[in-house]
Interface confidence: medium
């Protein structure tokens, strides 16, 4: 089958990194600089992606694969294949049309990207607020009052670490 296909279409023999040159009796010609073909049998090569401005080259273009971009410091990738770069904000902020704005009271953002999200409503689970929320951090919910027996600590202390080779006293 392969032999039949190549007899019917000489271009199927052209490997990645080349194009099938119709002007030259369908010989395989190497892709021009700044272009690539990632599959065999192509009639043209594709223009390499240029990582310019806020885009930074993560992987150089080769004759068989496109360039890959990421974003310069202070920006992060958005979209498939880092099609856009969006400005970073500080934790406790979100990006708006007017730039980075602090999270409103009752919301937080613990990343440099994304939007401010509402604090967890502990009471919905019948729990109480153990640690108050901030612009950068969500609230920490404590156990529900029913879980607390008189004199019980609201936070369970961690178990002491056991050293290897030592049995408990």
């Amino acid at each position: 089958f392969e032999r039949t296909r190549s007899l019917q279409d000489p271009c199927s023999n052209c490997p990645a990194g080349t194009f099938c040159d119709n002007n030259r009796n369908q010989i395989c010609s190497p892709c021009p600089p700044n272009s690539f073909s990632s599959a065999g049998g192509q009639r043209t090569c594709d223009i390499c992606r240029q990582c310019k401005g806020v885009f930074r080259t993560r992987k150089e273009c080769s004759s068989t694969s496109n360039a890959e971009c990421d974003c310069t410091p202070g920006f992060h990738c958005l979209g498939a294949g880092c099609s856009m770069c969006e400005q970073d904000c500080k934790q406790g902020q979100e990006l708006t049309k007017k730039g980075c704005k602090d999270c409103c009271f009752g919301t937080f953002n613990d990343q440099k990207r994304g939007i401010c999200r509402p604090w967890t409503n502990c009471s919905l689970d019948g729990k109480s607020v153990l640690v108050n929320g901030t612009k950068e951090r969500d609230v920490v919910c404590g156990p529900s009052p029913a879980d607390l027996s008189p004199g019980a600590s609201s936070v369970t202390p961690p178990a002491p670490a056991r050293e290897p080779g030592h049995s408990p006293q």
Epitope: F19, D21, N23, P32, N34, S35, R43, D46, I47
Partner: nanobody, 122 residues
């Protein structure tokens, strides 16, 4: 009609120099991405050097970096390839080529001249 006429090839000893010229007609060199491809005996075509982005950047194959220099004279509509420290493996027919950008986004290239033979031998 687009025409590319190469000249300047010849027989040279290893370590020697040559300057190839490509006189273009039918289009303006300065407005195009142009360069040099070569074909060694029994081998396929290889890109040697190019001027891209209307002169904004140059490309050199790894095998010729530091030895070959591409340039052009816009007034004469001529492309040059200065070749120095020539080696036996540089022996090939050298063609002037124009990169062609297609409407669908594809890229190919066109070379119309007969090429100029460069032979490096002692």
């Amino acid at each position: 009609e687009v025409q590319l006429l190469e000249s300047g090839g010849g027989l040279v000893q290893p370590g020697g120099s040559l300057r190839l010229s490509c006189a273009a007609s039918g289009f303006t060199l300065s407005a195009e991405d142009v360069g040099w491809v070569r074909q060694a005996p029994g081998k396929g075509l290889e890109w040697v050097s190019a001027i891209l982005d209307s002169g904004g950047s140059t490309y050199y194959a790894e095998s010729v970096k530091g030895r070959f220099t591409i340039s052009r004279d816009n007034a004469k509509n001529t492309l040059y390839l200065q070749m120095s420290s020539l080696r036996a493996e540089d022996t090939a027919v050298y063609y002037c080529a124009r990169v062609v950008y297609h409407a669908g986004g594809g890229v190919t290239y066109d070379y119309r001249g007969q090429g100029t033979q460069v032979t490096v031998s002692s």
